[in-house]
Interface confidence: medium
């Protein structure tokens, strides 16, 4: 009998669900009335009563039933009179529920729907605090963010008030998270008051006012460490090369470094003029892996950049004259490693390059003469062949286009410093001038096992960029000609936990207080990935990877030289976020320059612009392996 009842429950639930499927609970035809006390939207944890009153023709309900999310409630139901019943919930903690009630009418075969209602519980907004406004150099926007406080669970809107202290004109911007305000629209001089009002059905709060001066809130274009070299002087010293595209004259920077085994950072401060590449000297222990990061601010101003991405350098055991290592940015080395080659011309290496070129020319002439002799004298030919093979570097007589045979690849595969054991096929584009090897780690999706409670806490640390964003983060990929182009990626704003010991300060702006669980955030998105058909990688760093790919493609006219810088410039805010866990709509934003590269690689590609559907990319991506060949 129980089984029969359960089946009927299911039939009724399905029947009602199907009858609602076109309009939802709000569009059902009611034969009565359902209401909630104290209200349809109420404070989480309250005791609530749901009343159901039947008004069905020719029906004196034998019984009134309540359903929550399609499941019949069996307890705490009180019949008030012939037509009305009450369902009581103690300490209601569900953010959303769909309630409906039915009546058992005499002579009716099945329950009759009376009415339904969606109910919501949550919290009034906290006072927004830590209101912060910054202007990223080249962006053309003032980005304002705040700590929203604890998760409200209900629709909460924020009104950002911007009031000119000079003209007293006030502008208001409605948003559900952070706000980007075009600097062009800030016509009321340089000084403003900014404050944020938070409002939802349960209450309204207003932040303290933040006074800003537009000149004081500019964050310089990101500083990037490009390479490191260790020089054998009386005391071996390591030189770190770093640069920024900033046009700001007076810039103060900090470089922090530590052995990877250490907890504590050493910090060096610099007053910098970026008219040339910066060189910073460090006296480090031999045979130790160090990690470096740099950040800058306009001298005397309030806001710092985020720390640059991690740059690793291992000091040699016995120091040669110069050991140079370039671009060892690590994105938490937990998965696929792809070595890409950048053909940057480093000033310090140019003389070496010229020497090598001259040597090769002389060598080629010699080989030509010897081969001519060889044509006419077979015995001489075989004799000299052995001697030449002993003399010339091995890479010269290898099948150069076949990079699988290349010692460069073998070296990379053997060198544990650069490559993970589980790295997939190396994709190396051959170019005669290999000056820098950049390592990209594409992290696996890690489960967020440190998930916070629903009422997630306020982080202690300042995060000046992606805190800015509630569930959305704008990733700026700057083009020096046109300013920043915001590319929106939704991802979990859960803390920026790069490491368990909290030693890496993510200087992107603080994430909101109560980050949503990855499981219940409808806006959490997985980022499509293009890393040479590696389809299981769900990390934001894939966004970086698109840029890194442009380094591989950056062999001809198809790629602007800015791309490389711009991608490297802004990696940190991507690095410092947890991997999301759901799927993004099949559209990914790529720099137009990159898309044009793809077009050159394969003529069959449709002509498309920055909005680039993922499925097209995937279908054409295998063809990019042409690069290998």
């Amino acid at each position: 009998m129980n089984q029969v009842t359960i089946q009927w429950d299911a039939v009724i639930a399905l029947y009602i669900l199907f009858s609602w499927c076109h309009g939802g609970i709000t569009n059902i035809n009611c034969s009565g009335h359902i209401w909630v006390e104290p209200a349809t939207i109420f404070k989480m944890g309250m005791n609530i009563s749901i009343y159901c009153q039947a008004a069905i023709k020719n029906c004196q309900p034998r019984k009134l039933h309540f359903y929550k999310n399609g499941i019949k409630e069996r307890f705490q139901i009180t019949r008030i009179n012939k037509t009305t019943a009450r369902l009581w919930y103690k300490n209601f903690l569900e953010p959303h529920a769909s309630m409906y009630c039915t009546a058992e009418c005499p002579k009716h075969f099945q329950e009759t729907l009376i009415c339904g209602k969606d109910i919501s519980s949550g919290y009034p907004p906290d006072i927004p605090d830590e209101v912060t406004c910054v202007i990223y150099e080249y962006s053309g926007n003032m980005t304002c963010t705040w700590n929203a406080g604890k998760l409200t669970y209900i629709d909460t809107k924020y009104v950002v008030h911007v009031k000119s202290l000079e003209t007293e004109e006030e502008q208001q911007y409605l948003t559900s998270s952070y706000i980007n305000i075009s600097t062009d629209s800030l016509q009321g001089g340089k000084k403003y008051l900014v404050w944020v009002q938070a409002a939802n059905a349960l209450g309204m709060e207003e932040s303290k006012q933040l006074q800003i001066h537009l000149d004081d809130i500019v964050i310089p274009s990101a500083a990037v460490i490009s390479r490191a070299e260790t020089i054998n002087a009386t005391v071996p010293k390591t030189i770190i090369y770093w640069d920024s595209q900033t046009t700001i004259e007076k810039v103060s920077c900090e470089m922090r470094y530590k052995a990877t085994t250490n907890q504590t950072w050493n910090v060096k401060e610099f007053d910098t003029n970026f008219t040339y590449v910066q060189q910073s000297e460090f006296y480090l222990e031999p045979n130790i892996k160090y990690v470096f990061q740099v950040r800058c601010q306009e001298t005397g101003k309030r806001y710092w950049q985020p720390w640059s991405s991690l740059f690793f350098h291992k000091t040699p055991e016995t120091v040669p004259q110069v050991t140079s290592k370039a671009f060892q940015h690590d994105t938490w080395n937990s998965g696929l490693t792809v070595a890409s080659i950048s053909t940057g011309h480093l000033t310090s290496d140019n003389r070496g390059d010229i020497g090598l070129l001259l040597g090769m020319i002389v060598f080629a002439v010699m080989l030509s003469i010897l081969s001519l002799i060889g044509i006419f004298n077979r015995s001489f030919r075989t004799g000299i062949k052995r001697r030449i093979l002993l003399l010339i570097p091995k890479w010269l007589y290898e099948d150069i286009p076949n990079m699988k045979n290349s010692n460069v690849v073998k070296m990379l595969q053997e060198n544990s410093e650069l490559m993970n054991n589980n790295s997939s096929e190396q994709v190396l584009y051959v170019d005669p001038m290999i000056t820098e090897i950049k390592e990209i780690f594409i992290p696996e999706h890690k489960p967020t096992d440190y998930k916070k409670e629903n009422t997630g806490p306020l982080e202690t640390r300042d995060y000046p960029q992606n805190s800015l964003f509630d569930n959305t983060t704008v990733v700026y990929i700057p083009d020096l000609n046109t300013g920043y182009k915001p590319q929106i990626s939704n991802f979990l704003p859960e803390g920026s936990h790069l490491s368990n010991n909290n030693e890496i300060t993510s200087l992107t702006l603080k994430p909101p207080v109560d980050s949503l669980d990855s499981g219940n955030n409808p806006r959490l998105q997985k980022h499509p990935n293009f890393a040479f058909s590696v389809s299981s990688v769900n990390s934001l760093s894939n966004t970086i990877f698109l840029g890194e790919l442009s380094l591989i493609l950056n062999q001809g006219e198809c790629s602007s030289p800015d791309i490389q810088n711009s991608v490297e410039e802004e990696t940190t805010m991507l690095l410092e976020n947890d991997s999301p866990s759901e799927t993004i709509p099949e559209q990914t934003l790529l720099p137009d320059e990159f898309v044009s590269c793809l077009g050159i690689v394969n003529e069959e590609l449709p002509s498309i612009n920055t909005y680039f559907p993922q499925n097209i990319l995937e279908s054409h991506f295998n063809r990019i392996s042409l690069l290998e060949k």
Epitope: G45, Y123, D126, I127, D129, E130, T132, K150, Q263, T264, W265, V267, R302, Y303, W304, E453, T455, P457, L458, E459, T460, R461, D462, P464, N502, E503, T505, L507, L509, K510, V513
Partner: antibody
Framework: EVQLQQSGGGLVKPGGSLKLSCAAS????????MAWVRQTPRKGPEWIAF????????YYSDTVTGRFTISRENAKNTLYLEMSSLRSEDTAMYYC?????????????WGLGTTVTVSS | DIVMTQTTSSLSASLGDRVTISCRAS??????LNWYQQKPDGTVKLLIY???RLHSGVPSRFSGSGSGTDYSLTISNLEQEDIATYFC?????????FGAGTKLELK
């Protein structure tokens, strides 16, 4: 081991000024928000000021707003509290405190305190 | 401001006793309740944060519970070194506020 070494307390006349210092060691100073908490005899502690790890955010209790300034020098691992227009009711033991990973989670580590006496 | 009330200003107990100290907030503080121990020499230590989480290095005889506005700290097996004053503090809303303290003494 986390250590917060305080200094700068003393006797000062009403209306006078004083600057307290708190030298931090045993942790990455620039990773944590810091606060000043004071306590008068036979009373509970009173939070008076907070500064986020990079000094982006500064908060004060109403009792000291406009008179006290919290600041930090991350390069020197030092927290400061500059007190001006001192009143007799500011007489207390002043503690510097380091927050945990989350501000809501309270003051994870405390200094030993420094006494400030405001009296004519 | 949220007012934190510790109704018991002093409490006498014997070694080995189970001791409970209570704290009430003037409004819901969403479990952001922290407990501190202040020794007679003035040293202050965080014991419990977020209602029930033990701070590192704190003995497991300390525990916390509560929700909404009512919270408590329990010492399951009182030891000599636990003789101190205990303060609660809310971390939910600025300004952060403390209770007046409960002084624990030996019988």
């Amino acid at each position: 081991e986390v250590q917060l070494q305080q200094s700068g307390g003393g006797l000062v006349k009403p209306g006078g000024s004083l600057k307290l210092s708190c030298a931090a060691s045993g942790f990455t100073f620039s990773d944590y928000g810091m606060a000043w908490v004071r306590q008068t005899p036979r009373k509970g502690p009173e939070w008076i000021a907070f500064i986020s790890n990079l000094a982006y955010s500064v908060y004060y209790s109403d009792t000291v707003t406009g008179r006290f300034t919290i600041s930090r020098e991350n390069a020197k691992n030092t927290l400061y509290l500059e007190m001006s227009s001192l009143r007799s009711e500011d007489t207390a033991m002043y503690y510097c405190a380091r927050h945990g990973d989350y501000r809501n989670y309270g003051f994870a580590y405390w200094g030993l305190g420094t006494t400030v006496t405001v009296s004519s | 401001d949220i007012v934190m009330t510790q109704t018991t200003s002093s409490l006498s107990a014997s070694l080995g006793d189970r001791v409970t100290i209570s704290c009430r907030a003037s409004q819901d503080i969403s479990n952001y309740l922290n407990w501190y121990q202040q020794k007679p020499d003035g040293t202050v230590k965080l014991l419990i944060y977020y209602t029930s989480r033990l701070h590192s290095g704190v003995p497991s005889r300390f525990s916390g519970s509560g929700s909404g506005t009512d919270y408590s700290l329990t010492i399951s097996n009182l030891e000599q070194e636990d003789i101190a004053t205990y303060f609660c503090q809310q971390g939910n809303t600025l300004p952060w506020t403390f209770g007046a303290g409960t002084k624990l003494e030996l019988k």
